[in-house]
Interface confidence: low
């Protein structure tokens, strides 16, 4: 006859695992004791269990409550046994000794590898703002064993940096993902993806990407200097800007006070109608958490007489 | 996968109207800014408008200054454009594009829509 | 506006061949210049950005160099797949030009 058994057992931690150890003998053969040990290299073995084929099962005492046989039906000749709840420490080699009559002993040996998952975690980089360069956006720590992978899911372009480091019985691997921050990151995922052969399915973690910045701010409403003139009524500017966080806008008139009648709303500054007095020069101030940027313009307010009394002199001049 | 498909293109005769969508997807819309680029029969490329991501104003050709719109929903995740006051000089091919606005490297644009034929001819 | 140049217009090379297309521009662009392939009656599809970085996806025998006004796009090794217009772009100012294109002919 012959053992039949598994080269490998693998098992998620905290799971059975069964060891297999089925003797396939010739008719009329019978098996008498089935002795399970550890027989790691380096160590002496250390007796699991004793399956007797009439006095049961025997625990050493300890894996006393954790070593039982499968649920019945029983095959005589099947000397498999569980171990329940299986932890790292378990991870190793194990031999099942068969005695039959009257073949005599047979030995196999399997080994059993627990697999730790990963508990991934991910950790935000420093605030991000445009014009930094190169800068860790976030890095992704996950530790198991075997060996966990860590990669990256994102649209958002960037260069990824690994180390791992090894430990008695498991690895953990970190791994960074480092972007030059630009404003169309804004709200982009950006995610970490852990895979394990302990894992049913990869394991993810979204991180949502926040970059700060501000663009320069312009001004329009002056396309046109000749619209500018005394009596016009709705003359107004308005400040271009764009930012994250959103700006806040501010006016201000270089020259002294706002004149009276103009009216600040956010990013606009309306005018009553025109007069000299409205001639100046006006700065918008955008700015939020980020920076501030500032955008000025000259308004000068025509006079439309002076203009076609400088056309008459022009005439009579000759 | 980043898709944007161009569509309303069509025959117009001269001084008419078009309006031009571009559909997009496989992105978050809303963080790029967005393009139309343009390519008379047998000829370059060339731009024709800017939209930003939605505080600043468009940009616009020269050529086309004054007669047409560029417009965003980012409800709808779709770009715009209205041509009105159309001439002969319009006729080509709109293709919609997703800039990549990213200070370290500028407005370049790294996806197209197949493109959508406008001809304006009486 | 910005001018970019092209040159040739055309060229006819086989298979295997090194082929090189040079863009000028009219002033100062730094490195804000893109590279486009595009075949007949399809997109432009972006090769290269800033002058010499390979766009995700574009196989390495494509290379560009140059910055400030000079620019260059290089195939190593010229595929069956290759034979197509290409256009160089600059984003450094708006608007946004194009050089004229490079045809690319099969010998």
């Known amino acids: 006859g012959e053992l039949e058994t598994s080269d490998v057992v693998t098992v998620v931690l905290g799971q059975d695992a069964k060891l297999p150890c089925f003797y396939r003998g010739d008719s009329g053969e019978q098996v008498g004791q089935v002795a399970w040990a550890r027989v790691d290299a380096g160590e002496g073995a250390q007796e699991l269990a004793l399956l007797h084929s009439k006095y049961g099962l025997h625990v050493s005492p300890a894996y006393e409550g954790r070593v039982e046989q499968p649920p019945p039906p029983r095959n005589p000749l099947d000397g498999s046994v569980l171990l329940r709840n299986a932890v790292q420490a378990d991870e190793g080699e194990y031999e099942c000794r068969v005695s039959t009559f009257p073949a005599g002993s047979f030995q196999a040996r399997l080994r059993l590898r627990v697999l730790v998952p990963p508990l991934p975690s991910l950790n935000p980089g420093p605030a991000l703002e445009e014009g930094q360069g190169l800068t860790l956006a976030a890095s992704c720590t996950a530790e198991g064993s075997p060996a966990p992978s860590v990669t990256w899911d994102t649209e958002v372009k960037g260069t990824t940096s690994s180390r791992s480091f090894k430990h008695s019985r498991s690895a953990a691997v970190t791994s960074e993902f480092h972007l030059v921050p630009s404003r169309s990151m804004n709200g982009q995922p950006l995610t970490c993806v852990v895979s394990h052969p302990g894992l049913l399915q990869d394991q993810r973690i979204t991180h949502i990407l926040h970059v700060s910045f501000l663009a320069e701010a312009s001004v329009r409403g002056l396309e046109d200097q000749n619209l500018w003139h005394i009596g016009r009524e709705g003359a107004m500017l308005k400040c271009l800007s764009e930012g994250q966080p959103p700006p806040s806008y501010n006016w201000t008139r270089l020259d002294g006070p706002l004149p009276s009648g103009v009216r600040v709303d956010g990013d606009t500054l309306g005018f009553p109608p025109l007069t000299t007095e409205h001639s100046g020069i006006y700065v918008c101030h955008v700015s939020n958490e980020f920076s501030s940027r500032d955008s000025q313009v000259t308004v000068d307010v025509l006079d439309p007489q002076e203009d076609s009394g400088k056309q008459v002199d022009l005439v009579s001049a000759s | 996968e980043v898709q944007l498909v161009e569509s309303g293109g069509g025959l117009v005769q001269p001084g008419g109207s078009l309006r031009l969508s571009c559909a997009a997807s496989?992105?978050?819309?809303?963080?790029?800014?967005m393009s139309w680029v343009r390519q008379a029969p047998g000829k370059g490329l060339e731009w024709v408008s800017r939209i930003s991501t939605g505080f600043a104003g468009p940009d616009y050709a020269d050529s086309v200054k004054g007669r047409f719109t560029i417009s965003r929903d980012n409800s709808k995740n779709t770009l715009y454009l209205q041509m009105n006051s159309l001439r002969a000089e319009d006729t080509a091919v709109y293709y919609c594009?997703?800039?990549?606005?990213?200070?370290?490297?500028?407005?370049?644009?790294?996806?197209w829509g197949q493109g959508t034929l406008v001809t304006v001819s009486s | 506006d910005i001018q970019m140049t092209q040159s040739p217009s055309s060229l006819s090379a086989s298979v295997g061949d090194r082929v090189t297309i040079t863009c000028r521009a009219s002033q100062g662009i730094s490195s804000y210049l893109a590279w486009y392939q595009q075949k007949p009656g399809k997109a432009p599809k972006l090769l290269i950005y800033a002058a010499s970085s390979l766009q995700s996806g574009v196989p390495s025998r494509f290379s560009g160099s140059g910055s400030g006004t000079d620019f260059t796009l290089t195939i190593s090794s010229l595929q069956p797949e290759d034979f197509a217009t290409y256009y160089c772009?600059?984003?450094?100012?708006?608007?946004?030009?194009f050089g004229q294109g490079t045809k690319v002919e099969i010998k």
């Open positions: 496989g992105y978050i819309f809303s963080n790029y800014a």
């Open positions: 772009q600059q984003h450094y100012t708006t608007p946004p030009t």
């Open positions: 594009a997703r800039q990549t606005e990213d200070r370290s490297y500028g407005y370049d644009l790294d996806y």
